[in-house]
C-alpha cells in the first residue's frame, strides 16, 4: 500500500489511523525535505487533490480536516511545493480506515453434520464493521476445564477428534478489531445432542392412477442414526403456503410417502430430518418438482435429464434443484 513509500517527512492521523466511521478527523503532514522551505503543502485522497479545510500550522506542517468521515478506506498522501522545483515533492502517505467496533456475537450455534468429522460453529456477527475483525471461538470442556481457542474471520470447523475433553462443552465467541472487543454468551453443548443426520434426498415420484390418484414420493438418507424424525413439505408451485407432513423414520430402506394431490398441477416437495428429540434440523433438501397427470400415470426421477416418453405411457422429468427464498438452510 501507500505506507511503503519513501518519505521526506511524515503524515499522521488524529485520533488514529483506524477510527469510528462518522468521526471528525485531522490529517497532519510535516515536511522534512533537504533545501526546501515548502511554499505550499497539498493533500491527496485516493489520488485526488483536496481543495478545502486545509490549514497551514507552521513553515513545515499543515492540517487537513474532515467532518463526518464515512469512507471505509482511503489512501492519503501529501506533497510540498518547493522553490526551484518544477514538480510537487512527495512527503509521505498513509492508508486510513473507518468502521465500527464489533457487536456482541449472538445466536452461537454448533452442529455436527453426520460423517463430516467436524463440529461447525456459526454465529450472528451483527452489523458490518468495515474493518478487519477477528473472531476467537472458545471451546471449554465442562469435564476437564481444558479450553481450546480457534482464530477465524467467520465460522469455524473443529475436528471432533480434537474434542478430547468428554462430551460436554461450553462454546463462546469473542469478536475483536482495532475499535473494540465483545464476547457472546456461553453456549452449553453435548456432542451427542448436536448431530444432524446425513442429508435426506427425494429420489423420485410416481402417481398411481387409481380411483383416487395417489402420488408416492421416494426418499432416503445414508444416516446411521436409528431414531430420526422428518418433515416433508409440499405445495403447488402457484401457492405461497406449504403443507407439512411429519414422519418417524427408519432409514434401513427407502421411504415411500403417499399424497393425494390435485390432478394436472405442478407440485414442489422438500424434506428435512433431525435426530428425534434433538434441537437441530437439516436444511431443507433441494426442491423436487412433480406434475400430477390428468389421467396417465407419471414418474418423476432425478435420473432423467429432460422430458422423455417412456413406452408412450409414463412421463419422466428432471427435478430441478434450484433453491428459492423458501429454501433457506435453517438449522434452528
Amino acid at each position: 500500500g501507500i505506507t511503503n513509500i519513501n518519505c521526506s517527512g511524515h503524515i499522521w492521523v488524529e485520533p488514529a489511523t483506524i477510527f469510528k466511521m462518522g468521526m471528525n478527523i485531522s490529517i497532519y503532514c510535516q515536511a522534512a525535505i533537504k533545501n526546501c522551505q515548502p511554499r505550499k503543502l497539498h493533500f491527496y485522497k485516493n489520488g485526488i487533490k483536496e481543495r478545502f479545510q486545509i490549514t497551514r500550522i507552521n513553515k513545515t506542517t499543515a492540517r487537513l480536516w474532515y467532518k463526518n468521515f464515512l469512507e471505509p478506506h482511503a489512501s492519503m498522501y501529501c506533497t510540498a511545493e518547493c522553490p526551484k522545483h518544477f514538480q510537487e515533492t512527495l512527503i509521505c502517505g498513509k492508508d486510513i480506515s473507518s468502521g465500527y467496533p464489533p457487536d456482541i456475537p449472538d445466536e452461537v450455534t454448533c452442529v455436527i453434520y453426520e460423517y463430516s468429522g467436524n463440529m461447525t460453529c456459526t454465529w450472528n456477527a451483527g452489523k458490518l464493521t468495515y474493518i478487519d475483525t477477528k473472531y476467537v471461538v472458545h471451546v471449554k470442556s465442562l469435564e476437564t476445564e481444558e479450553e481450546q481457542q480457534y482464530l477465524t474471520s467467520s465460522y469455524i470447523n473443529i475436528s471432533t477428534d480434537s474434542l478430547q475433553g468428554g462430551k460436554k462443552y461450553l462454546v463462546w465467541v469473542q469478536a475483536a478489531n482495532a475499535l473494540g472487543m465483545e464476547e457472546s454468551k456461553q453456549l452449553q453443548i453435548h456432542l451427542d445432542d448436536i448431530v444432524i443426520p446425513s442429508a435426506a434426498v427425494i429420489s423420485r415420484a410416481e402417481t398411481i392412477n387409481a380411483t383416487v390418484p395417489k402420488t408416492i414420493i421416494y426418499w432416503d438418507s445414508q444416516t446411521t442414526i436409528e431414531k430420526v424424525s422428518c418433515e416433508m413439505r409440499y405445495k403447488a408451485t402457484t401457492n405461497q403456503t406449504w403443507n407439512v407432513k411429519e414422519f418417524d423414520t427408519n432409514f434401513t430402506y427407502v421411504q415411500q410417502s403417499e399424497f393425494y394431490l390435485e390432478p394436472n398441477i405442478k407440485y414442489v416437495f422438500q424434506v428435512r430430518c433431525q435426530e428425534t428429540g434433538k434441537r437441530y434440523w437439516q436444511p431443507w433438501s433441494s426442491l423436487f418438482f412433480h406434475k400430477t397427470p390428468e389421467t396417465v400415470p407419471q414418474v418423476t426421477s432425478k435420473a432423467f435429464q429432460h422430458d422423455t416418453w417412456n413406452s408412450g405411457l409414463t412421463v419422466a422429468s428432471i427435478s430441478t434443484g434450484h433453491l428459492t427464498s423458501d429454501n433457506r438452510g435453517d438449522i434452528g
Epitope: 465442562l142 481444558e146 461450553l170 464476547e183
Partner: antibody, heavy 121, light 112 residues
Framework: QVQLVQSGAEVKKPGSSVKVSCKAS?????????MCWVRQAPGQGLEWMGC?????????YYANWAKGRVTITADESTSTAYMELSSLRSEDTAVYYC????????????WGQGTLVTVSS | IVMTQSPLSLPVTPGEPASISCQAS??????LAWYLQKPGQSPQLLIY???KLAAGVPDRFSGSGSGTDFTLKISRVEAEDVGVYYC??????????????FGGGTKLTVLG
C-alpha cells in the same frame, strides 16, 4: 513437574515501568496453555492482573483495572513469560506472582516464588 | 463476575469442622478453585472444578457447589491449616469487564 522461577525484587520510581520475568520449565510448549499474573499488596488479598493464552495463536486478557497499563508477553524460545506494568504509583507496591497449570485450564497448580516490586520516590 | 467470600475471618478449635462460602455473581458452572496461602508463602491449590481434590491435598478438605454457590469444608481442622483461603472463578477471563477473579479471602486461625 512445572517450575516457575521469577526475576528478583525491584525498587522503582513513580511514573516509571517495571518488567518482571517468569521462566518456566516442565511445560509442553507444543500444547495450549495459560500463563497468568496475580499480585498481592502488603496485607491484602490476591488480585488477578491478566493472562496470556499460547496455542495455535496467542491471546491476552487483562483485568479491567489493568487495561492500558499491563502488558503480558511470552517468549517461547526461552520458555519465559513477562509482565510489564507502566505508570507506576505507590499503590502498585506488591508481590507479583506468575501462575499456571501448564495447560489450558484457569486454575493454578503452580506458582512462582513471587517478585516484590516497591514503588517509592 | 464478582466473587464474594464469607466469613472474613474464621477462628476454629483444632479437630472441629470449618466451612467457607463463596458466591459468584453469575453462573460459573463448576469452574471454581480454592487456594490456601500460608504466611510468607505462595498460594497452593486445594480444590479445582468445585469438588476435585488437588494432588497431595489431605482428604479432610472437600469442595461442593455449582452455578453460583460454593462451599469449602475442612472436616477436622489441624494447626497446619492456618492461613488465608481464596476462591477463584475459572470459567472465563476473556470477558472485557472482569475486575478480579478471586474472592476477598477468609483468614482461618486455630484457637488454643
Amino acid at each position: 513437574q512445572v517450575q516457575l522461577v521469577q526475576s528478583g525484587a525491584e525498587v522503582k520510581k513513580p511514573g516509571s515501568s517495571v518488567k518482571v520475568s517468569c521462566k518456566a520449565s516442565g511445560i509442553d510448549f507444543n500444547s495450549n496453555y495459560y500463563m497468568c499474573w496475580v499480585r498481592q499488596a502488603p496485607g491484602q488479598g490476591l488480585e488477578w492482573m491478566g493472562c496470556i493464552y499460547v496455542g495455535s495463536h496467542v491471546n491476552t486478557y487483562y483485568a479491567n483495572w489493568a487495561k492500558g497499563r499491563v502488558t503480558i508477553t511470552a517468549d517461547e524460545s526461552t520458555s519465559t513469560a513477562y509482565m510489564e506494568l507502566s505508570s507506576l504509583r505507590s499503590e502498585d507496591t506488591a508481590v507479583y506472582y506468575c501462575a499456571t497449570s501448564g495447560s489450558s485450564v484457569l486454575y493454578f497448580k503452580f506458582w512462582g516464588q513471587g517478585t516484590l516490586v516497591t514503588v517509592s520516590s | 463476575i464478582v466473587m464474594t467470600q464469607s466469613p472474613l475471618s474464621l477462628p476454629v478449635t483444632p479437630g472441629e469442622p470449618a466451612s467457607i462460602s463463596c458466591q459468584a455473581s453469575e453462573n460459573i458452572y463448576s469452574f471454581l478453585a480454592w487456594y490456601l496461602q500460608k504466611p510468607g508463602q505462595s498460594p497452593q491449590l486445594l480444590i479445582y472444578s468445585a469438588s476435585k481434590l488437588a494432588a497431595g491435598v489431605p482428604d479432610r478438605f472437600s469442595g461442593s457447589g455449582s452455578g453460583t454457590d460454593f462451599t469449602l469444608k475442612i472436616s477436622r481442622v489441624e494447626a497446619e491449616d492456618v492461613g488465608v483461603y481464596y476462591c477463584q472463578q475459572t470459567n472465563r477471563y476473556s470477558n472485557p469487564d472482569i475486575y478480579n477473579v478471586f474472592g476477598g479471602g477468609t483468614k482461618l486461625t486455630v484457637l488454643g
